[in-house]
């Protein structure tokens, strides 16, 4: 898998998952994004993939969550620590993952069809600087 293409596909899936409301979005999951600043990408991807794997046990799997899990796993450490005490909803987890992935995508200088998405996200968060 090409890293940039994988990130792009993950963002697309997250766009769909966060656009659709269902009871599964209220599931409580571990807030794995409160990790220290020096946590590696591979560790964060592993933690996020672990959360998604746990969702399967709640009968809440669909093809976008499955695809997301496969893509994250392809870029992640094989094992990771999951010591988080804090919790969040699945919807908040996916929204935060989307922001993280968008940042990674733009950092790699790829801003073709996601330019509109980036602007929309910036306006929503009241940021008006340009990358």
């Amino acid at each position: 898998h090409n890293f940039n293409i994988t990130i792009k596909e993950i963002i697309k899936m997250l766009n769909i998952l966060t656009a659709r409301n269902d009871s599964c979005m209220e599931l409580t999951v571990k807030d794995v994004f409160t990790a220290p600043k020096n946590t590696s990408d591979k560790e964060i991807f592993c933690r996020a993939a672990t959360v998604l794997r746990q969702i399967y046990t709640h009968n809440c799997s669909n093809r976008y969550l499955r695809g997301l899990y496969r893509n994250l796993s392809s870029m992640a450490n094989k094992t990771c620590s999951m010591n988080e005490i804090k919790k969040s909803t699945l919807k908040d987890f996916l929204e935060r993952l989307k922001v993280i992935m968008q940042k990674k995508y733009y950092r790699h200088g790829l801003n073709d069809i996601f330019e509109a998405q980036k602007i929309e996200w910036h306006e929503h968060h009241h940021h008006h600087h340009h990358h």
């Epitope: 697309k12 899936m13 766009n15 409301n21 269902d22 496969r70 509109a116």
Partner: antibody
């Protein structure tokens, strides 16, 4: 060979109910999300509903939310669409469709196999 | 009212090429591109290709796709009689949280 065989279409009065069925064969039914799409006379295709592989979650178009219910029986390899409070504008050919699973280069926003369609006519 | 806009009809002669456009917005095609389907009357719609050109096995390479911003185009070269059908584009719309289809384009083969 993937096959989706539909049944249940009929002539029904406004306000009436109908249940459509779609029997799947040739693939692992319990591993795929499934959808219903319709084609009304003189109109284009319209997506109606989706159900995840395990039966939850489910999703609906605004036009049918609260009136139609999608369900599945993985033991019987069958997908259902329960249609209540039917209106004249629900007259259409209804298709069941298998949602494409994510594979590299095909991210899953498509429907790769469709049933033959079943006609639902809502008229007094 | 379809979210994606297609011409109602296009026509071409045997052996010629035609292009069918499908236009959307930043909420659908601009993010996800689109998928194309071929629909013959009385038959099941058939998955034809992704806008980026990915084709399932069995679809001839006479069918190709391209995308540009919020629009996609289906190209069919060396037209054959059996290509006469309705063609639909489809995407996902983040505002609606739903799959959306184009209004459909009827392809007529002349002569």
């Amino acid at each position: 060979e993937v096959q989706l065989v539909q049944s249940g279409g009929d002539l029904v009065k406004p306000g009436g109910s109908l249940r459509l069925s779609c029997v799947a064969s040739g693939f692992a039914f319990n591993g795929y999300d499934m959808d219903w799409v319709r084609l009304a006379p003189g109109k284009g295709l319209q997506w109606l509903s989706e159900i995840s592989s395990s039966g939850s979650p489910t999703y609906y178009a605004d036009a049918v939310e609260g009136r139609f219910t999608i369900s599945r029986d993985n033991a019987k390899n069958t997908l259902y669409l329960q249609m209540d409070s039917l209106r004249a504008e629900d007259t259409a050919v209804y298709y069941c469709a298998r949602a494409g699973e994510y594979t590299y280069g095909y991210e899953g926003y498509y429907f790769d196999y469709w049933g033959q369609g079943t006609l639902v006519t809502v008229s007094s | 009212q379809s979210m994606l806009t297609q011409p109602a009809s296009v026509s071409g002669s045997l052996g010629q090429r035609v292009a069918i456009s499908c236009s959307g917005s930043t909420n659908n095609i601009g993010i996800f591109g689109a998928t194309w389907y071929q629909h013959l009357p009385g038959k099941a719609p058939k998955f034809l290709l992704y806008s980026d050109g990915n084709r399932p096995s069995g679809v001839p390479d006479r069918f190709s796709g391209s995308d540009s911003g919020n629009s996609v185009t289906l190209m069919i070269t060396a037209l054959q009689a059996e290509d006469e059908a309705d063609y639909y584009c489809q995407s996902f719309d983040t505002t609606l949280g739903a799959y959306v289809f184009g209004s459909g384009t009827q392809l007529t083969i002349l002569g």
